[in-house]
């Protein structure tokens, strides 16, 4: 039963992935742990709150050219880390200087792996928060939205839209745009140097 769902989700992902390298990465192998859906969705380290302590936070070490898009890629942590031991921003990949940080392509693939995991969660009651999130994941992956304006004509007010998955896709798009802009900038610099 799960296999057709996994295959169709995979096809959806490949269709939606924005760049060829991302597709290549996703198609290299199965999603770790895809057969046994995790008990809880695995949060991304990037979005984990820092431990609540009264000690002042250390400023995060950041490359000079770090911008919003790159920040998204650089701060994506290991998806297999236990949610019980989240990374704080200060101890994240950025703080490590030359530590092994995922490439943009890996980060993109990781991002979609999380959404894929959401798709693979066991079925839940129709209106539980988890079910809403699951529907949100499908919507974020191009599925049918539950409450668009055209369906709002009915007397019943629709369930409010879960924006989170849409938001995450946008952050990913911003990261991609930022990366392309940086590549263009680097290319221009290179051409200037060659031109001289």
């Amino acid at each position: 039963m799960r296999l057709p769902l996994l295959v169709s989700a995979g096809v959806l992902l490949v269709a939606l992935l924005p760049c060829p390298p991302c597709r290549a990465l996703l198609s290299r192998g199965p999603v770790p742990g895809a057969r046994q859906a995790p008990q809880h969705p695995q949060p991304l380290d990037f979005f984990q709150p820092p431990p609540q302590s009264e000690q002042p936070q250390q400023p995060q070490a950041r490359p000079v050219l770090l911008r919003m898009g790159e920040e998204y890629f650089l701060r994506l942590g290991n998806l297999n880390k236990s949610p019980a031991a989240p990374l704080s921003p200060a101890s994240s990949l950025l703080a490590g200087g030359s530590g092994s940080r995922p490439s943009p392509e890996q980060a993109t693939a990781n991002f979609f792996r999380v959404l894929l995991q959401q798709l693979l969660l066991p079925r839940r009651s129709l209106d539980s928060p988890a079910a809403l999130a699951e529907r949100g994941a499908r919507n974020a992956l191009g599925g049918h939205q539950e409450a668009p304006e055209r369906e709002r004509r009915s007397e019943e007010p629709p369930i409010s839209l879960d924006l989170t998955f849409h938001l995450l896709r946008e952050v990913l798009e911003m990261a991609r745009a930022e990366q392309l802009a940086q590549q263009a900038h680097s290319n221009r610099k290179l051409m200037e140097i060659i031109g001289k």
Partner: antibody, heavy 115, light 112 residues
Framework: EVQLVESGGVLVQPGGSLRLSCAAS????????MTWVRQAPGKGLEWVAN????????YYVDSVKGRFTISRDNAKNSLFLQMNSLRAEDTAVYYC????????WGQGTLVTVSS | DIVMTQSPLSLPVTPGEPASISCRSS???????????LEWYLQKPGQSPQLLIY???NRASGVPDRFSGSGSGTDFTLKISRVEAEDVGIYYC?????????FGQGTRLEIK
Amino acid sequence: EVQLVESGGVLVQPGGSLRLSCAASGFTFSSYWMTWVRQAPGKGLEWVANIKQEGSEKYYVDSVKGRFTISRDNAKNSLFLQMNSLRAEDTAVYYCARTLIFDYWGQGTLVTVSS
Amino acid sequence: DIVMTQSPLSLPVTPGEPASISCRSSQSLLHSTGYNPLEWYLQKPGQSPQLLIYLGSNRASGVPDRFSGSGSGTDFTLKISRVEAEDVGIYYCMQTLQTPITFGQGTRLEIK
């Protein structure tokens, strides 16, 4: 450089209509949700409406449902807010903002509803 | 609707001193994925708002590292490690977990 420029704000009588525009440049307009946020004089920020990338889905704050319509023209990199049946309480500076985290804002356009 | 409540509403600070603003939501913003869709904005006098922090703890492009965001669930904090004169304005938190998107009422930071 990302730029958002609102226009169309004027003095209008209660019950009147108005169409606000937001001209976007410096980014791929069709890739992002777009939003209208307003701020009444001396008050805080209030989300008004947002629209998905391709314009297929639109969401509104309750106070403007049925009166305001958000739309976009991706070919012209433009966002619109059609405002009908205007009320005094709609008086505000209207901002357009990019994405669902509102990472860029326009300078705002003032709409005054008064008789 | 999710109600966002900020405190304090007014915050006089001496330059060089730290400042902290609290934002509470009427329901948890912790999404099933582990994300907290909570943003912080600063509106300087006579200007449009500008994004400071997105998704709870991530600094936006060009934002000085003296600004940091933390928190999860219903309690969030914006900290400024050393306030500067240019930090004056009204700070807003906002939730983007679900529609309708809602803002806090704002915290006015002023220099003592």
